[in-house]
C-alpha cells in the first residue's frame, strides 16, 4: 500500500505528488488532502484564530493592548476570565502565519510574565518562573516541485508532506531550576 | 479529487474504504494510512508512552508509587526535575489505551493536586486551583464495517476515519473563579 499523501503518477511512485497551480485553490492544499473527517477547525490552535483576529480587529478600533506586559491580577476580574487570564503564569495567544503550512494560521501561546503572579500581592514574583507547555500538532507542509521531471521548480506547483510541529499551548508556573 | 482516507471501491465512493482482516497488520491501521511523513512517534503524547511504560516497569520492581498524591518537590530536587515536577500545579502522565484508535496508546496528563503548591510553605493551598490544559490531537479511529454491502459487519473488517481528540498536556495554576 502507498502513503495517501504520496499518491502520484507512476514515475513519482513513493514521492510526494506534484500539484499544478490549476489543481490548487488559491495556492492552498488540494481539498482531498485536507481529510474531510479530520475537521481541522476543531483543533484548538486553529479554532482560536478567528476569535483572536476578531478581537484584534476590535482592539484596533478601541484602545491599544498592553497584552505583552505581565498583568496585575485583580480578584474581581477573575470571575469571568478564561484559564489563560486566571493563571498565575498568564499567557496570550498570538496568530502565527506560515504561507507554506496548512493550516496557515495557528494560535501560539506566549507567556506574559517571566516570573509568576504572587496571589498574595497580585504582582509578579521572580521566585517562580512561567514556562511554556508545548504540544505536537500535525500539519501539512508545501514545497515547490517540478512537474516535468527536470528538477527545476514549476511555477505555482507544489508537493505536500505531513509533519509534526511544536505548538506552545499555554504556560505553567514552576520552581526555578537554578538561581 | 477524493479524500485520501476515503479511497475505496467505486461502489463505496465517498465513504470510508472497508479493509479486510488480511489487509490489516494485527488489527491495526493499514500502513498507507499512517502517512509516512507524519512521523507519529514525534507527537509528544506518543513519544512519552515508551518512557512511561519503562518507568512503570521499573517501579513495579522497585517501590510502590505515591504518584496520585499532591507532592512537594524538595528544594534539592528542584535543580534536576522536569517541568511537570517543578510546576506548582504538578502533574503525572498516564498511558491511555484505546484499541480502536491509532495511536492506541497516548500519554494523558493528570493534575496531582486539587489546589497548587504554596511556594512559601511547600504545602498545597486551596486558595489556588490546578487545572488541566487541553490540546487537540489528530488520531485515526476504526469502526467495524461491511465488505459485502449487506450492512452487517464483516468479522475482522474495519473502516478508518480521522478525528481530533482533546488530550490533557499539562496543568496550570489559576485563581479560582469563585471563592
Amino acid at each position: 500500500h502507498q502513503d495517501p499523501f504520496l499518491r502520484g503518477h507512476p514515475h513519482t511512485h513513493g514521492t510526494p505528488r506534484c500539484y499544478s497551480a490549476e489543481e490548487l485553490p488559491l495556492g492552498q492544499a488540494p481539498p482531498h488532502l485536507l481529510a474531510r473527517g479530520a475537521k481541522w477547525g476543531q483543533a484548538l490552535p486553529v479554532a482560536l484564530v478567528s476569535s483572536l483576529e476578531a478581537a484584534g480587529h476590535r482592539r484596533r478600533h478601541d484602545r491599544p493592548s498592553a497584552a505583552t506586559q505581565c498583568p496585575v491580577l485583580r480578584p474581581e476580574e477573575v470571575l469571568e476570565a478564561d484559564t489563560h487570564q486566571r493563571s498565575i503564569s498568564p499567557w496570550r495567544y498570538r496568530v502565527d502565519t506560515d504561507e507554506d503550512r496548512y493550516p496557515q494560521k495557528l494560535a501560539f501561546a506566549e507567556c506574559l510574565c517571566r516570573g509568576c503572579i504572587d496571589p498574595r500581592t497580585g504582582r509578579e514574583t521572580a521566585a517562580l518562573n512561567s514556562v511554556r507547555l508545548l504540544q505536537s500538532l500535525l500539519v501539512l507542509r508545501r514545497r515547490p516541485c517540478s512537474r516535468d521531471g527536470s528538477g527545476l521548480p514549476t511555477p505555482g506547483a507544489f508537493a505536500f508532506h505531513t509533519e509534526f510541529i511544536r505548538v506552545p499551548v499555554g504556560c505553567t508556573c514552576v520552581l526555578p531550576r537554578s538561581v | 479529487h477524493q479524500d485520501p482516507f476515503l479511497r475505496g471501491h467505486p461502489h463505496t465512493h465517498g465513504t470510508p474504504r472497508c479493509y479486510s482482516a488480511e489487509e490489516l497488520p494485527l488489527g491495526q491501521a493499514p500502513p498507507h494510512l499512517l502517512a509516512r511523513g507524519a512521523k507519529w512517534g514525534q507527537a509528544l503524547p506518543v513519544a512519552l508512552v515508551s518512557s512511561l511504560e519503562a518507568a512503570g516497569h521499573r517501579r513495579r520492581h522497585d517501590r510502590p508509587s505515591a504518584a496520585t498524591q499532591c507532592p512537594v518537590l524538595r528544594p534539592e530536587e528542584v535543580l534536576e526535575a522536569d517541568t511537570h515536577q517543578r510546576s506548582i500545579s504538578p502533574w503525572r502522565y498516564r498511558v491511555d489505551t484505546d484499541e480502536d484508535r491509532y495511536p492506541q496508546k497516548l500519554a494523558f496528563a493528570e493534575c496531582l493536586c486539587r489546589g497548587c503548591i504554596d511556594p512559601r510553605t511547600g504545602r498545597e493551598t486551596a486558595a489556588l486551583n490546578s487545572v488541566r490544559l487541553l490540546q487537540s490531537l489528530l488520531v485515526l479511529r476504526r469502526r467495524p464495517c461491511s465488505r459485502d454491502g449487506s450492512g452487517l459487519p464483516t468479522p475482522g473488517a474495519f473502516a478508518f476515519h480521522t478525528e481530533f481528540i482533546r488530550v490533557p498536556v499539562g496543568c496550570t495554576c489559576v485563581l479560582p473563579r469563585s471563592v
Epitope: 514574583t125 521572580a126 521566585a127 518562573n129 520552581l175 526555578p176 531550576r177 537554578s178 538561581v179 | 512537594v72 518537590l73 524538595r74 528544594p75 534539592e76 528542584v78 535543580l79 534536576e80 511556594p119 512559601r120 510553605t121 511547600g122 504545602r123
Partner: antibody
C-alpha cells in the same frame, strides 16, 4: 512580635555532642521551612541544614551529613539540632532562620545565635 | 571557597553611594534575579535587606537597592549613613552538595 530564640550552645570536647534548640513565636511556625546557619569566628555565613514545615523532609550540607540531625516539634513551636562527633571546625555561632520561600535562601527572620565552641 | 565572589571591603563617606558586587555563574546568579542580601552588624544576627534581586522587605530603607547585570548581582546603598557600617552578604541557591551558598562577605566602612 515575630522572633526566633536559640539556646543550648556551650563548650564541648572534640567527639562530644550538643543539642541546640530554637523557640519560635509571633508567627505560624508549622507553615515554614526552617534552616540552621552557622558562622565561624571572623568568617562568613555557612548554611548547615533545613527541615520542612511538617518535619518530614530534612537536608544537610556535606560538611555535617551523618553527624548532625535536625528536627522540630510543631506543637511546641520548637526546632532542634542534635550535633554529634563534634570537631574543632564546627566551632561557630549557630543561627536558626525562617525561609520566606521554602526552596530559596531568603531567610527573613533570624535568631540572635548561640555559640558552640569545640575545644579540648 | 564560596561560589559567590564579593569584594572583601568597600568604603565611602556619609552621603555618598556605594555598590557591592556579587559575582556568580550563568547557572546561578545569571539565570534568574533571585539573589538575596543580608546586613550584619558586629555581634548581631544577619538581617534580610533585599530578596528576589531587587525587592525590599518592609522596614528596610529605600536607600538600599538591588540589581543584576549578567552574572553579577549588586547591592547599592545611597546616602550612606554611619549606621550602614556592617558586613554584607549575598546568597543564592547552590547545588545538591551545598544547597544554599553565601558570598564571602564585604565589610563596609563609612569614613569620617
Amino acid at each position: 512580635q515575630v522572633q526566633l530564640v536559640e539556646s543550648g550552645g556551650g563548650l564541648v570536647k572534640p567527639g562530644g555532642s550538643l543539642r541546640l534548640s530554637c523557640a519560635a513565636s509571633g508567627f505560624t511556625f508549622s507553615d515554614h521551612y526552617i534552616s540552621w546557619i552557622r558562622q565561624a569566628p571572623g568568617k562568613g555565613l555557612e548554611w548547615v541544614s533545613y527541615i520542612s514545615s511538617s518535619g518530614s523532609t530534612t537536608y544537610y550540607a556535606e560538611s555535617v551529613k551523618g553527624r548532625f540531625t535536625i528536627s522540630r516539634d510543631n506543637a511546641k513551636n520548637s526546632l532542634y539540632l542534635q550535633m554529634n562527633s563534634l570537631r574543632a571546625e564546627d566551632t561557630a555561632v549557630y543561627y536558626c532562620a525562617r525561609q520566606s520561600y521554602y526552596f530559596l535562601p531568603y531567610f527573613d527572620v533570624w535568631g540572635q545565635g548561640t555559640l558552640v565552641t569545640v575545644s579540648s | 571557597q564560596s561560589a559567590l565572589t564579593q569584594p572583601a571591603s568597600v568604603s565611602g563617606s556619609p552621603g555618598q553611594s556605594i555598590t557591592i558586587s556579587c559575582t556568580g555563574t550563568s547557572s546561578d546568579v545569571g539565570s534568574y534575579n533571585l539573589v538575596s542580601w543580608y546586613q550584619q552588624h558586629p555581634g548581631k544576627a544577619p538581617k534580610l535587606m533585599i530578596y528576589e534581586g531587587s525587592k525590599r522587605p518592609s522596614g528596610v530603607s529605600n536607600r538600599f537597592s538591588g540589581s543584576k547585570s549578567g552574572n553579577t548581582a549588586s547591592l547599592t546603598i545611597s546616602g550612606l549613613q554611619a549606621e550602614d557600617e556592617a558586613d554584607y552578604y549575598c546568597a543564592s541557591r547552590g547545588s545538591r552538595r551545598v544547597l544554599y551558598v553565601f558570598g564571602g562577605g564585604t565589610k563596609l566602612t563609612v569614613l569620617g
